[in-house]
């Protein structure tokens, strides 16, 4: 029986009965928040073999092992993960071992086993046999291994029953509990699963099988399950579903998402039955189950019941997130706000069409309208009194409408009105007339030439850069000395710079009148010598990073023919030099034979250039004589050997480490002080733990259903 869609067992242990007939849980399994210690021995679910998403255990009192509950759980597919994890065991106060002795495969995702004070048999499980990559596993804060004394079956009787593998250079027996070995298939099977008798399964089987080389005898399927058979791909007229099985069209046509209160139904796309068309696709008509590619961003029509949507805060803008067509009128009235330009772009940046009018008034926080970065059509189906479809009134800091070199905007019907925008140059308005096709529609009073732009440098001269020099973290630039008609009017220069991976930035990006600005600013005084060109050294930059830079002259508000003259440069794009990359991450080595080592690593977090090759160095180390000094068969004399696992529990450090020579004489030494990098790593580690714990709590503590 397929159970699902996701099973949440909490508060009452008797809810476990819901699992009675399940062979596959299509979704997740949560067992959590059972605070009263119970006797779980009467609960056993031998039918359960597969969980398609993840298994989460959290604060279940009295549960000592999972082996009795789920003796045949073989595969956790990890089709959807819990914060990147397919198996999470967190704060299980009484759990003594995991005991999932038939667990053979976690197809996707890592494991997180944390804060289980009594949990042992963690170092005896070779997770690399179950997961593809163990580097993201997080096993921290459990019972210290030295207090566990984990022994695999037969070890004490000197008749070890389990097989050995190497983990962290330690060759040892692998088991789940004191009487359950970890199953390993013969090397002849390669990546294939095997039966209890070590016969190789069919290649389409995953985890295990009841008969060798038979695709109908698999416990779980490597790819997809259809009509009792494991298949590499779904047969014609069937579709992949939930990552593990094939369903027919009729099935897909009749299912709805339980996460939504609408009844939109699933779609078939690219051979899969899925809840929504993927990004960049849209349903092909209201009754269709199929997806077609969108031309540009996928359309999303938003409508305002009251016809006019007032945007006076980030919250009101949030309602328009993802909208591409707005049916109605936009009234923008942003007087203040924090980081307002980028917030508005985030929520309104996809709007392409407004069917009514657009009115911007008293928006003193706005410097530019570029946050409406995709607006291309104002239909003007509804207009303001006086037949206006674009109305801009009393915006004290508005300096730019849009970057007209990269913007096509059409106003299909209606006129434009501009008044009392003291920093908006009339030339900018005239440019908009030309681009939008409204030239000739406006009457004389619609664009006021006296109170628009009367406090702006509307006649701008161009500053030209004369030289640029770069190093790995510095840029030196110089520019022509600007000479206004009256030299005394030139006060200084301001250099603006920021990281710009693409050559598409504008002066007003991320800028608002409330102090937010995505540009870094540096003031540059005039050189005292009139023959020296002004310049700046920008330092503390990142290697191999493209920056955008422009310069503005700071001048007195000198009026000449009713206009203030100013000067600024074009935007210059310049890349810093390459540098040495940071160290490669997550270096792991393992031996797969007596003469080979396999070394794996991840690329550096800061490549600081184009990586062309890696250098791998190795050297032979003397054999550790410590290995031969102990009787490993004696339970009491197992030596405490620590392997760095990326975390340090303070209480585990019980004595000063002995070092060879310290201060000229042999003897105990204090631990070296932590480096900045180590301190930073510990800080990040603590932060990561907090983030996960918050995620866990936010996910599982939910209001009671009404």
């Amino acid at each position: 029986e397929i159970c699902g869609p996701g099973i949440d067992i909490r508060n009452d242990y008797q809810q476990l009965k819901r699992l009675e007939n399940c062979t596959v849980i299509e979704g997740y399994l949560h067992i959590l928040l059972i605070s009263k210690a119970e006797d779980y021995r009467s609960y056993r679910f031998p039918k359960l073999t597969v969980i398609t998403e993840y298994l989460l255990l959290f604060r279940v009192a009295g549960l000592e092992s999972l082996g009795d509950l789920f003796p045949n759980l073989t595969v956790i597919r990890g089709w959807k993960l819990f914060y990147n994890y397919a198996l999470v065991i967190f704060e299980m106060t009484n759990l003594k071992d995991i005991g999932l002795y038939n667990l053979r495969n976690i197809t996707r995702g890592a494991i997180r086993i944390e804060k289980n004070a009594d949990l042992c048999y963690l170092s005896t499980v070779d997770w690399s046999l179950i997961l593809d990559a163990v580097s993201n596993n997080y096993i921290v804060g459990n019972k210290p291994p030295k207090e566990c004394g984990d022994l695999c079956p037969g070890t004490m009787e000197e008749k070890p029953m389990c097989e050995k593998t190497t983990i962290n250079n330690e060759y040892n027996y692998r088991c789940w509990t004191t009487n359950r070995c970890q199953k390993m298939c013969p090397s002849t099977c390669g990546k294939r699963a095997c039966t209890e008798n070590n016969e190789c399964c069919h290649p389409e089987c995953l985890g295990s099988c009841s008969a060798p080389d038979n695709d109908t005898a698999c416990v779980a399927c490597r790819h997809y399950y259809y009509a009792g058979v494991c298949v590499p791909a779904c047969p014609p007229n069937t579709y992949r579903f939930e990552g593990w099985r094939c369903v027919d069209r009729d099935f897909c046509a009749n299912i709805l998402s339980a996460e939504s209160s609408d009844s939109e139904g699933f779609v078939i796309h690219d051979g899969e039955c899925m809840q929504e068309c993927p990004s960049g696709f849209i349903r092909n008509g209201s009754q269709s189950m199929y997806c077609i590619p969108c031309e540009g961003p996928c359309p999303k029509v938003c409508e305002e019941e009251k016809k006019t949507k007032t945007i006076d805060s980030v919250t009101s803008a949030q309602m328009l997130q993802g909208c591409t067509i707005f049916k109605g009128n936009l009234l923008i009235n942003i007087r203040r706000g924090n980081n307002i330009a980028s917030e508005l772009e985030n929520f309104m940046g996809l709007i392409e069409v407004v069917t009514g009018y657009v009115k911007i008034r008293h928006s003193h926080a706005l410097v530019s309208l570029s946050f409406l970065k995709n607006l291309r059509l104002i239909l003007g189906e509804e207009q303001l009194e006086g037949n206006y479809s674009f109305y801009v009134l009393d915006n004290q800091n508005l300096q730019q409408l849009w970057d007209w070199d990269h913007r096509n905007l059409t106003i299909k019907a209606g006129k434009m009105y501009f008044a009392f925008n003291p920093k908006l140059c009339v030339s900018e308005i005239y440019r908009m007339e030309e681009v939008t096709g409204t030239k000739g529609r406006q009457s004389k009073g619609d664009i006021n030439t006296r109170n628009n732009g009367e406090r702006a440098s509307c006649e701008s001269d161009v500053l030209h850069f004369t030289s640029t020099t770069t190093s790995k973290n510095r840029i030196i630039i110089t520019w022509h000395r600007y000479r206004p008609p009256d030299y005394r009017d030139l006060i200084s220069f301001t250099v603006y710079y920021k990281e710009a991976p693409f050559k598409n930035v504008t002066e007003y990006d991320g800028q608002d009148a409330c102090g937010s600005n995505s540009w870094n600013m540096v003031d540059v005084d005039l050189p005292p010598n009139k023959d020296v060109e002004p310049g700046i050294l920008l330092h503390g930059l990142k290697p191999w990073t493209q920056y955008a830079v422009y310069v503005k002259a700071v001048t007195l508000t000198m009026v000449e023919n009713d206009h203030i003259r100013g000067a600024k440069s074009e935007i210059l794009y310049i890349r810093t030099n390459a540098s040495v990359p940071s160290i490669p991450l997550d270096v792991l080595s393992a031996s797969n034979s007596s003469s080979q080592l396999i070394v794996k690593w991840n690329p550096p977090s800061l490549p600081n250039g184009n990586l062309s090759y890696y250098i791998v160095r190795w050297q032979r180390q003397p054999q550790d004589g410590y290995l031969y000094r102990h009787n490993y068969c004696s339970k009491d004399k197992i030596p405490i050997r620590k392997y760095a696992d990326g975390t340090i529990d303070i209480e585990e450090v019980t004595e000063n480490p002995k070092t060879e020579v310290c201060g000229g004489e042999k003897g105990p030494c204090c631990a070296c002080p932590k480096t900045e990098a180590e301190k930073q790593a510990e800080k990040e580690e603590a932060e990561y733990r907090k983030v996960f714990e918050n995620f866990l709590h936010n996910s599982i503590f939910v209001p009671r259903p009404e």
Epitope: G6, I255, L256, A258, E259, S261, D262, E264, R283, Q287
Partner: nanobody
Amino acid sequence: EVQLVESGGGLVQPGGSLRLSCAASGFTFGTFGMAWFRQAPGKEREGVSAISASSGRTYYADSVKGRFTISRDNSKNTLYLQMNSLRAEDTAVYYCAVRSKQGAGYGFWYEGRLYGYWGQGTLVTVSS
């Protein structure tokens, strides 16, 4: 408070037609999926038809396909079921239901668990 009030039921001869209405209040009608269910005497409740809010996508039970038509008028907050070519086996109490979020996963449109609120029902009797 969510309210669903069905109307339009009654006695009709086989082959005849009826139009059921469901007046909704207490929620934003235009954003919720809706459905019609029915329960014949001594039988389980079964899904008849459903309709989505955003696109108007419709679903029908095999037994009514081609005879019944579901529709909605979001401006009037009303759900309709046009029933033509009625048969004796269509006799039942017809209920209107509104979708609700039910956590993760999926369900079939005709599963009652996907619906959070129900009307009181209207009786349709098909008899000669």
